[in-house]
């Protein structure tokens, strides 16, 4: 399977919420013993791979913003604490799965990533991430709505 | 914060079945893989196995004809049971949580168990 | 299984020197490998994982480097607390192994 990022790049209003999403793509083993979990944090991109570090989204780790299931099942976060912090994710049963950032500041800009790994619990963990960047500004340049971009080439959509 | 803690016999006879219980307090069981781990006198670090907070388990298979690890989520506690124990088998057992892709980032204090007669 | 080498098995240092702990895996785990440091009488306690990040809250003496099969752990300047077993890990797959401990004691 693979992870994609329908937008590299997401520009948004200060004070805007924004959806981060990723798209698990390809055969999903949905046998009793593969499971999936799925996360999000921040990273940079580094010297040896991005996503290699995983920094928390507005203090809260991958570990607290982590969604667990099997196959293509539903699934959300602890809600209380991510609602605290004006996030949430989310997973849908097509293989998508998305983090939700409200009331948007400059701190909020940078490299985000989601994680999938596969677990076959008698042979290994599969994993794969995807990566795209999130630009907040302020100002009279900035736009009055989120403009995303897609990730396979550089027209920009915006969302309203 | 998470905790982790060990709690059984710290003496077992040989040919007897190994029990302890990891009681989990501060976050949920319902995530993350959790762990027993082992570290005999003088020796390293042994993986023992695990259980999945749904129930798949997975073991080491140098012990695997002799373990079993369970669950019980509804008092947030995690057992392992190790059968016709010897002398081999004495160690300081650990319990720890193990975070898919990442480490085993959260360990009980370990409780030591002798098998002796 | 795979099994992981560490060397040395004891490493004398004096406090304020640096200390280099290696670990070689019998096969490539890519960089899929932690490490872990253990006082007497104490659980193990992460430092590093996917072989170059500091876990929460770990000083930035420590840092890890390598990938494939070859792995080495930095101590920059040693601190009295910092005398410890030091165990490697590797996580490609099951089961999950363990290298055989380097042990830093002072000099």
């Known amino acids: 399977f693979k992870v994609a990022t329908p937008y590299s790049l997401y520009v948004c209003p200060e004070g805007q919420q924004v959806t981060l999403t990723c798209r698990l793509l390809g055969p999903v083993d949905k046998g009793h013993d593969v499971t999936f979990y799925k996360t999000w944090y921040r990273s940079s991109r580094g010297e040896v791979q991005t996503c290699s570090e995983r920094r928390p989204i507005r203090q809260l780790t991958f570990q607290d913003l982590h969604l667990h299931h099997g196959g293509h099942q539903a699934a959300q976060t602890s809600h209380d604490l991510a609602q605290r912090h004006g996030l949430e994710s989310a997973s849908d049963h097509h293989g998508q799965f998305s983090i939700t950032m409200r009331n948007l500041t400059l701190l909020d800009s940078g490299l985000y990533c989601c994680l999938v790994v596969e677990i076959r619990h008698h042979h290994s963990e599969h994993r794969v991430h995807g990566a795209m960047e999130l630009q907040v500004q302020t100002g009279k340049d900035a736009p009055s709505n989120c403009v995303v971009y897609p990730s396979s080439s550089q027209d920009s959509e915006q969302i309203t | 914060q998470v905790q982790l803690q060990e709690s059984g016999p710290g003496l077992v006879k040989p040919s007897e079945t190994l029990s302890l219980t990891c009681t989990v307090s501060?976050?949920?069981?319902?995530?993350?893989?959790w762990s027993w781990i082992r570290k005999p006198p003088g020796k390293g670090l042994e993986w023992i196995g695990y259980?999945?907070?749904?129930?798949?388990?997975n073991y080491n298979p140098s012990l695997k004809s002799r373990v079993t690890i369970s669950v019980d989520t509804s008092k947030s506690q995690f057992s392992l049971k190790l059968s016709s124990v010897t002398a081999a088998d004495t160690a300081v057992y650990y319990c720890?949580?193990?975070?898919?892709?990442?480490?085993?980032?959260?360990w009980g204090q370990g409780t030591m168990v002798t098998v002796s007669s | 299984e795979i099994v992981l080498t560490q060397s040395p098995a004891t490493l004398s240092l004096s406090p304020g020197e640096r200390a280099t702990l290696s670990c070689r895996a019998s096969?490539?785990?890519?960089?899929?490998l932690a490490w872990y440091q253990q006082k007497p009488g104490q659980a193990p306690r992460l430092l590093i994982y996917?072989?170059?990040n500091r876990a929460t809250g770990i000083p930035a003496r420590f840092s890890g480097s390598g990938s494939g099969t070859d792995f080495t752990l930095t101590i920059s300047s040693l601190e009295p607390e910092d005398f410890a077993v030091y165990y490697c890990?590797?996580?490609?797959?099951?089961?999950?192994?363990f290298g055989g401990g380097t042990k830093v004691e002072i000099k």
């Open positions: 259980i999945y907070y749904s129930g798949s388990t």
């Open positions: 720890a949580r193990d975070i898919p892709a990442f480490a085993l980032d959260i």
């Open positions: 096969q490539s785990v890519s960089y899929y």
């Open positions: 890990q590797q996580r490609i797959n099951w089961p999950l192994t």
């Open positions: 501060g976050g949920s069981i319902s995530s993350y893989y």
């Open positions: 996917d072989a170059f």
